[in-house]
Amino acid sequence: RPSFSLVEDTTLEPEEPPTKYQISQPEVYVAAPGESLEVRCLLKDAAVISWTKDGVHLGPNNRTVLIGEYLQIKGATPRDSGLYACTASRTVDSETWYFMVNVTDAISSGDDEDDTDGAEDFVSENSNNKRAPYWTNTEKMEKRLHAVPAANTVKFRCPAGGNPMPTMRWLKNGKEFKQEHRIGGYKVRNQHWSLIMESVVPSDKGNYTCVVENEYGSINHTYHLDVVERSPHRPILQAGLPANASTVVGGDVEFVCKVYSDAQPHIQWIKHVEKNGSKYGPDGLPYLKVLKHSGINSSNAEVLALFNVTEADAGEYICKVSNYIGQANQSAWLTVLPKQQAPGREKEITASPDYLE
């Protein structure tokens, strides 16, 4: 059987908020140069399967064999590394499965620096020690598929070394990527080995390849960018926030409301209050007091901090968020305990993450 090893990332990522878009990371097939590699297209009911490498159609040749749902690469070389995809065309739809092939005999994925001393951060390679380009930090390159909301910034990086120091250039869909190819151009930070595109638009979709080369060799790495157009929706509040809280008289407490909204949201913190001993007005509606709202004079509107609380502060606190499409609200209760009934817990000062997009 052809030899290969399958490396799967089993890290569980937190659930993405609604204004983020994520394509699951492809499986990585690793092979040493000279080995053979076999990959099965993991799509069901595939009537017709087509294959691509780095966005370019892949056909059979003397080293590449395509049989049914299998791709075989005989005598793999580093040039076979890249982002592969198999597309199953059906009568009513099509589906694509992405995977990565990494053909290498030595990859350094450690941190680029030890930083053991505070002076020089790195030592230049001995001028006599000639070396073809190599990747210095493959961790920064693992995420090949980038699905990004329109208007966001995108950064692709290819940290590399070599002697003499290699140069870096970028291709889009296999062709030289020029500044005039996108409105606003792009930025290249050579010291970071990165390509940066601000405010991406749908026409930025495609494959971006860094080519790193010196007189002793050339290496390349391809990223796929998908730009997702935002769809407006009413605000969405993270479940479980704000959270119920308890504190003693004289204590401090903080409520956090985490908001996801493409459209500009307006946040209000509201509390039910009593007026003349009644919680409801003559019209049957509850008496409400706006404690805080987003605006020019309000920082961190998504956090409501209460200091030196009294028993009168106990009750329900409502986080109400609205945008031009609609509104949402969630509430939490504050329990105020007498000083002798302090809740027994480890003393900890924390700030929950807060966000207003």
Partner: antibody
């Protein structure tokens, strides 16, 4: 050891100009990107501008674009910030900072120089 | 520009407390985030780079975590010299931005 020493600050009228300098020592200056960061009295930090070691990459904050110019002289191990058309809101302590290799963490900072724009 | 929102803006704590400060980015910034400490009249000092790496010479009670949009700076056991203002800083974009700062005061 790494040292960064700013100079050139002072009092200037609105619309005036000032040139800040940052003398660097203790490291190979041309190997590092350098930045200017400012802090208005009682306020937070605000990034102003960055220049890479070979001067081929330069970037400015929107608030200073077209008015400030960053430059460097690697033979003199010195970073500069030419500030023109100064405004009251440019009043701040200006720090020069070295960027960590392969990253943009400011690992060394100068002591800062105060620029006051007032009539 | 990428906005960085720090919380809380200030907090009161005692020596020995565990303190957590959070920073949220308006978009995914990978791990391109640093944390600084600044004391009155002094220049900022780098504590954590690339979200979780401790800068040389910084005490191990400081730690950083997070990636994407949510980041945390934790001081495991607050010491007298830790009372200061802390800033997060993103460098994912070419236009760097800082959080508004969190002032850690003595309770």
């Amino acid at each position: 050891q790494v040292q960064l020493l700013e100079s050139g600050g002072g009092l200037v009228q609105p619309g005036g100009s000032l040139r800040l300098s940052c003398a660097a020592s203790g490291f190979t200056f041309s190997d590092y990107a350098m930045s200017w960061v400012r802090q208005a009295p009682g306020k937070g930090l605000e990034w102003v501008s960055t220049i890479e070691g070979d001067s081929n990459y330069i970037e400015y904050a929107d608030s200073v674009k077209g008015r400030f110019t960053i430059s460097r002289d690697n033979s003199k191990n010195t970073l500069y910030l030419q500030m023109n058309s100064l405004r009251a809101e440019d009043t701040a302590v200006y720090y020069c900072a070295r960027e960590r290799t392969y990253s943009s963490a400011f690992d060394y900072w100068g002591q800062g120089t105060l620029v006051t724009v007032s009539s | 520009d990428i906005q960085m929102t720090q919380s809380p803006s200030s907090l009161s704590a005692s020596v020995g407390d565990r303190v957590t400060i959070t920073c949220r980015a308006s978009q995914d910034i990978s791990s391109d985030l640093n944390w600084y400490q600044q004391k009155p009249g002094k220049a900022p000092k780098l504590l954590i780079y690339d979200a979780s790496n401790l800068q040389s010479g910084v005490p191990s009670r400081f730690s950083g975590s997070g990636s994407g949009t949510d980041f945390t700076l934790t001081i495991s056991s607050l010491q007298p010299e830790d009372f200061a203002t802390y800033y997060c800083h993103q460098w994912y974009s070419t236009l760097y931005t800082f959080g508004q700062g969190t002032k850690v005061e003595i309770k």
